[in-house]
C-alpha cells in the first residue's frame, strides 16, 4: 500500500509543527474507501491531552495533515495513519522523541528478521544518576543500574527476536517524566532474511537499496526516494512514493523530513539525507535514506548521495561493474497491469555486443512457462522483441521476466504484472432528484472488481419498451442529468463500469426504475377579491390568465406573521375560483396567496393580499320569521341578540335564492334599534333564503335560516306591514 | 406593436410625493399583469410593484411598502404608482414593463423609464 | 424574500471563449427564472425565461440551465456585441427579486 506518514523535524515549535499522512494508491479516494485517518495513538504512550483539540486538514481525499499542537509534550508519542480499503487497510506508525529528553535513540526504528538479536541503543542526553528502566509496550522489561552506561549509552539486547517482539520501547530514568524517555519501534519480520510467504518457504526478490521484503506478500517496501519492484530505480531529488509521484514540500526539498512507510519498513530519513533530525547530508561515498548505503563505483563512476552511482559511458549496473558489451535489457516498466481476458502484447528491449538477435529474446511467466517473441524490431542501438501473450488470467498476475542471452553474456529484467478484473456494479444508481423531463441520478455504486473506475456509462430507456437504450458517458464523481426526458414516466436505468486499459468494461449493473415528475403548472393566479365572511371565516376569490394545461387545484397559504404559523387549505379542484376558509383565528392578521399545483409541483404564488380579520362578533339574533307581503317584497323579523359583547352598530341580512347556484346577497340594517325589514325587488313566486347577524366589533354568528316565498302577480299579503327605513336601499351586490 | 411610456418623473424634496404613470398601447391591456422596476444610478435592478389584471390584487418590495401605491385605469390603458415620502435612495430610473400571463416567465415588454432625483 | 445571488460579480473574457454566469437562489424556485441583458443606457432585454427557454430573436449562442436553487447562464462563443450586464431574475413567489448583476467586458 502507497502509504507515507511525514514528519518535518526542522520545526521546534509545536504550534507549527505538523504531520501530513499521503496516500498514492490508484483510486484512492473512491467514495467506496474509507477516508485516511490521522491521529495520536495513546495506547502505549500516554501524555497528558492536548492543551486544545488537534485539528485536520484534509487536501482532497489523499492526503490529511494534523497540526493544533500547543506545547512539546503535545508532540510526544506515537502517531498513526491508517489508509486503504479491505484486506489493503494499513497503518503507518510514526513516534516522536522529545528533542529535550534525558535519553534519546541512536536509532528509532528497527527491522530485524525472525531470529536475529536486536539492539536498541539509547545515548544519554541529560544525565540523571538513576536507574534506567526498559519497557515494551507499556510494561515492564528490564532494569539498567545508571552506571552500566557504555560510552554514554544504555542498550538493551534481544536474542532471538519474534513476531510478538515488535512494538514499542522505551527507556526511562528512574523517577523521571515519562516525556524525557527514549522511544522505539521494533519490527520484527515473519520470516528469516530473504524469506517471506506462509511457512516462509519463498524467496523474496533481492529488494535493492535498502528495501525491506514483505513477509507476507513478497513485496519489497522501498525506502523513500526509490522506486521498482526491487526498489532498482531511484527517483529525481526530492520525489518519494511508490511511483515517485510526490514530491517533498517546501524550497529544502526532504531535509528534515521523517518517513515512515508501511511495515517492515518503519522510518528513516529521505534519501540523501542523515542525523535524528534528518538535517545532515551524506558524507562522501554514501546514498539513500538515511545515508545507509556505500557507492563502491567502478569504472570512473562518480557517487550521487541521492541515486548512487552515476555510470560513465560505456558501463551500467548498481556499481558501474558491467561493461556495456555484456547485453543489457533497456529500460522497462517495473510495474504493468491488464485486464482479465486480453491478450496484450509486452515488449522487450536489449543492447548489447554481440546483438540480440530474434531467438536470444524470452519471456517468463510466473508459471515458468517461456514465450517466445513473434515479432523483432532491431534498430540501431537496439533490438525490441515483441510478446503475443495468450489470454491473461487472475493466475498470471506475479513476477514475469525477460531474459536476453548472447555470447557476450546474459542479463534478465523482472517486472510485476497485475492482472485486474473490470468493476461490475453490484447496485443499481441512485435517484437524486427529478422533474418533469429530467432525472438527476448518482452514477457512484458499489461494484465488484478493481477500480480505478476510468469512465462511467449510463444507459436508460422508458420502462417496458423495446426501443435502444440512450447512452452517455459520465463523469464518476459527477451527479449526472438526464435531460429532454418525458413527463410522468418510468425509465429504467442502468450503470456499466470501465477501468483503464483495453478490456477495462465491465458488465451491465442491475437497473432502477426512475419515474420523472408531472409537469410543472406554469400559470400563476391572481387573488381577484377576498370577503371576511366572519371572525373566522374568509371567501377567497382568485383567477388564471388562461385555462391551465396542467394542474391538480390551488394551495392557498395563509401566513399569521404575528404568531409565525402557516396555514394551508388544499383545494384539489383545477376548476375552482373560489373558496371558503373557515376556522381562522379573529382579530388575526394574515398574508394570503394562492398558487396551481400538479402533482407535487407548486406553480409561481400570486402577490400576497393582506386580510385582516375582526375580533369575534355577537351571538345570533334570535327568532328570525319571514312572511311575504306581495310578489316583490317579504318582510323578516328577529329579536336582538341575548347579551351581546357591546352596542350593536348594524344588523346584516343575508338573502338567497333557495335551490340556486349563484352568490348570496347582503343588505345592512344600519339602525340597530331595527329588529324588522322589507325586502324589496324581489321576484315573483320565487323561495328565498333569509339569514342575519349583528355587528359589534365583529361580525356575529348567523341566526337559524328561514325560507318565505314572494306572492304570485297579483295576489297581496292579508297581514300588517311593518317596514324599517332602514330598508329602503335595495339590495347590496 | 406593444408600447409602454412612462411620465411624472422629476425633482423631489425628501419627503416629498410623485404620481409615476405609463401609458400602455397595442395590446389588450385588461388581460395583463403589470409591475413596476426602478434602477438607481449605476446600481442593478430591483424588482418594486405588482398589479393584477383586474387591479384587484397588488404586491410590493419591502423596501416602498407603506409608501407607494400601485394602481391602474383599464378604461384608460394606463398604469400608476403614486409614490409618497420619498427618500433619496428612491432616486432611481422608473420602469414600467408587462408581466407574463403565464409560461414564459420574464418580462419581455419595458418602457423607457422615467428619471425620479430625490434631493434637497 | 427570495435572495438570488450572481457570480461573478463582474468578467472578462476573450472574443470566441464560453462564458458562464451562475445565479443562485436562497430557496428552490423550480424552474421560474428569467435572464436579461443590459447594455449602458438601454433597457433591459429578455435572453431567456423560465429558466432554459431562449426568448425570439436571441442567439442561439445564449443557453440558460438549472432549476432549483442554481441556474447557469452561458455564452458558447463570445462576441464583441455581448458586453453588458447580465441579470437573474425569479418568479416563483413575491417580491420577483433580481440578482445584483454580472458585468461582462471583453479582454
Known amino acids: 500500500v502507497d502509504l507515507t506518514l511525514l514528519a518535518n523535524l526542522r520545526i521546534t515549535d509545536p504550534q507549527r509543527f505538523f504531520l501530513t499522512c499521503v496516500s498514492g494508491e490508484a483510486g484512492a479516494g473512491r467514495s467506496s474507501d474509507p477516508p485516511l485517518l490521522l491521529e495520536k495513538d495513546d495506547r502505549i504512550v500516554r501524555t497528558f491531552p492536548p492543551g486544545q483539540p488537534l485539528y485536520l486538514a484534509r487536501n482532497g481525499s489523499h492526503q490529511v495533515t494534523l497540526r493544533g499542537f500547543s506545547k512539546p509534550s503535545d508532540l510526544v508519542g506515537v502517531f498513526s495513519c491508517v489508509g486503504g480499503a479491505g484486506a489493503r487497510r494499513t497503518r503507518v506508525l510514526y513516534v516522536h522523541n522529545s528533542p529535550g529528553a534525558h535519553l534519546f535513540p541512536d536509532k528509532v526504528t528497527h527491522t530485524v528478521n525472525k531470529g536475529d538479536t536486536a539492539v536498541l541503543s539509547a545515548h544519554v542526553h541529560k544525565e540523571k544518576q538513576t536507574d534506567v528502566i526498559w519497557k515494551n509496550n507499556g510494561s515492564y522489561f528490564n532494569t539498567l543500574d545508571w552506571q552500566e552506561a557504555d560510552d554514554g549509552r544504555f542498550q538493551l539486547q534481544l536474542q532471538n527476536v519474534q513476531p510478538p517482539s515488535s512494538g514499542i520501547y522505551s527507556a526511562t530514568y528512574l523517577e523521571a517524566s515519562p516525556l524525557g524517555s527514549a522511544f522505539f519501534r521494533l519490527i520484527v519480520r515473519g520470516c528469516g532474511a530473504g524469506r517471506w510467504g506462509p511457512g516462509c518457504v519463498k524467496d523474496c526478490p533481492g529488494c535493492l537499496h535498502g528495501g525491506v521484503c514483505h513477509d507476507h506478500d513478497g513485496e519489497c517496501v522501498c525506502p523513500p526516494g526509490f522506486t521498482g519492484t526491487r526498489c532498482e530505480q531511484a527517483c529525481r531529488e526530492g520525489r518519494f512514493g511508490q511511483s515517485c509521484q510526490e514530491q517533498c514540500p517546501g524550497t529544502a526539498g526532504c531535509r528534515g523530513l521523517t518517513f515512515c512507510l508501511p511495515d517492515p519498513y518503519g522510518c528513516s530519513c529521505g534519501s540523501g539525507w542523515r542525523g535524528s533530525q534528518c538535517q545532515e547530508a551524506c558524507a562522501p561515498g554514501h546514498f539513500g535514506a538515511d545515508c545507509r548505503l556505500q557507492c563502491q563505483c567502478q569504472n570512473g563512476g562518480t557517487c550521487d548521495r541521492f541515486s548512487g552511482c552515476v555510470c560513465p559511458s560505456g558501463w551500467h549496473g548498481v556499481h558501474c561493474e558491467k561493461s556495456d558489451r555484456i547485453p543489457q535489457i533497456l529500460s522497462m516498466a517495473t510495474e504493468v497491469e491488464f485486464n482479465i481476458g486480453t491478450m496484450p502484447r509486452i515488449n522487450c528491449a536489449a543492447a548489447g555486443n554481440p546483438f540480440p538477435v530474434r531467438g536470444s529474446m524470452k519471456l517468463r511467466k510466473p508459471d515458468g512457462t517461456m514465450l517466445l517473441s513473434t515479432k523483432v524490431i532491431v534498430e540501431p542501438d537496439r533490438t525490441t522483441a515483441e510478446f503475443e501473450v495468450p489470454s491473461l488470467t487472475l493466475g498470471d498476475s506475479g513476477f514475469w521476466e525477460c531474459r536476453v542471452s548472447t555470447s557476450g553474456g546474459q542479463d534478465s529484467r523482472r517486472f510485476k504484472v497485475n492482472v485486474k478484473v473490470p468493476p461490475v456494479p453490484l447496485t443499481a444508481p441512485r435517484l437524486l432528484a427529478k422533474q418533469s423531463r429530467q432525472l438527476v441520478v448518482s452514477p457512484l455504486v458499489s461494484f465488484s472488481g478493481d477500480g480505478p473506475i476510468s469512465s462511467v456509462r449510463l444507459h436508460y430507456r422508458p420502462q417496458d419498451s423495446t426501443i435502444a437504450w440512450s447512452a452517455i458517458v459520465v463523469d464518476p464523481s459527477e451527479n449526472v442529468t438526464l435531460m429532454n426526458l418525458k413527463p410522468k414516466t418510468g425509465y429504467n436505468v442502468r450503470v456499466q463500469l470501465s477501468r483503464p486499459g483495453e478490456g477495462g468494461e465491465g458488465g451491465w449493473g442491475p437497473s432502477a426504475l426512475m419515474t420523472t415528475d408531472c409537469p410543472e403548472p406554469l400559470l400563476q393566479p391572481w387573488l381577484e377579491s377576498w370577503h371576511v365572511e366572519g371572525p373566522d371565516r374568509l371567501r377567497v376569490s382568485w383567477s388564471l390568465p388562461s385555462v391551465p394545461l396542467s394542474g391538480d387545484g390551488f394551495l392557498l397559504r395563509l401566513w399569521d406573521g404575528a404568531r409565525g404559523q402557516e396555514r394551508r387549505e388544499n383545494i384539489s379542484f383545477p376548476q375552482a375560483r373560489t373558496a371558503l376558509l373557515t376556522g381562522l383565528t379573529p382579530g388575526t392578521h394574515y398574508q394570503l396567496d394562492v398558487r396551481l399545483y400538479h402533482c407535487t409541483l407548486l406553480g409561481p404564488a400570486s402577490p400576497p393580499a393582506h386580510v385582516h380579520l375582526p375580533p369575534s362578533g355577537p351571538p345570533a339574533p334570535r327568532h328570525l320569521h319571514a312572511q311575504a307581503l306581495s310578489d316583490s317584497e317579504i318582510q323578516l323579523m328577529w329579536q336582538h341578540p341575548e347579551a351581546p359583547s357591546g352596542p350593536i352598530s348594524k344588523y346584516i341580512v343575508e338573502i338567497q335564492v333557495a335551490g340556486g347556484s349563484g352568490d348570496p346577497q347582503w343588505m345592512d340594517v344600519d339602525r340597530p334599534e331595527e329588529t324588522s325589514i322589507i325586502v324589496r325587488g324581489l321576484n315573483a313566486s320565487t323561495r328565498y333564503l333569509f339569514r342575519v347577524r349583528a355587528s359589534v366589533q365583529g361580525l356575529g354568528d348567523w341566526s337559524n335560516t328561514v325560507e318565505e316565498a314572494t306572492l304570485g302577480n297579483g295576489l297581496q299579503s292579508e297581514g300588517p306591514v311593518r317596514e324599517s327605513r332602514a330598508a329602503e336601499e335595495g339590495l347590496d351586490q | 406593436e406593444v408600447q409602454l411610456l412612462e411620465s411624472g418623473g422629476g425633482l423631489v424634496q425628501p419627503g416629498g410625493s410623485l404620481r409615476l404613470s405609463c401609458a400602455a398601447s397595442g395590446f389588450t391591456f385588461s388581460m395583463y399583469g403589470m409591475v413596476w422596476v426602478r434602477q438607481a444610478p449605476g446600481k442593478g435592478l430591483e424588482w418594486v410593484s405588482v398589479i393584477s389584471p383586474s387591479g384587484g390584487n397588488t404586491g410590493y418590495a419591502d423596501s416602498v411598502k407603506g409608501r407607494f401605491t400601485i394602481s391602474r385605469d383599464n378604461s384608460k390603458n394606463t398604469l400608476y404608482l403614486q409614490v409618497n415620502s420619498l427618500r433619496a435612495e428612491d432616486t432611481a430610473v422608473y420602469y414600467c414593463?408587462?408581466?407574463?400571463?403565464?409560461?414564459?416567465?420574464?418580462?419581455?415588454?419595458w418602457g423607457q423609464g422615467t428619471l425620479v432625483t430625490v434631493s434637497s | 424574500d427570495i435572495q438570488m445571488t450572481q457570480s461573478p460579480s463582474s468578467l472578462s473574457a476573450s472574443v470566441g471563449d464560453r462564458v458562464t454566469i451562475t445565479c443562485r437562489a436562497s430557496q428552490g424556485i423550480g424552474h421560474y427564472l428569467a435572464w436579461y441583458q443590459q447594455k449602458p443606457g438601454k433597457v433591459p432585454k429578455l435572453l431567456i425565461y423560465t429558466a432554459s427557454t431562449l426568448q425570439s430573436g436571441v442567439p442561439s449562442r445564449f443557453s440558460g440551465s438549472g432549476s432549483g436553487t442554481d441556474f447557469t447562464l452561458t455564452i458558447s462563443s463570445l462576441q464583441p456585441e455581448d458586453v453588458a450586464t447580465y441579470y437573474c431574475?425569479?418568479?416563483?413567489?413575491?417580491?420577483?427579486?433580481f440578482g445584483q448583476g454580472t458585468r461582462l467586458e471583453i479582454k
Open positions: 414593463a408587462r408581466a407574463p400571463r403565464g409560461y414564459s416567465y420574464g418580462y419581455y415588454y
Open positions: 431574475q425569479q418568479f416563483n413567489s413575491y417580491p420577483h427579486t
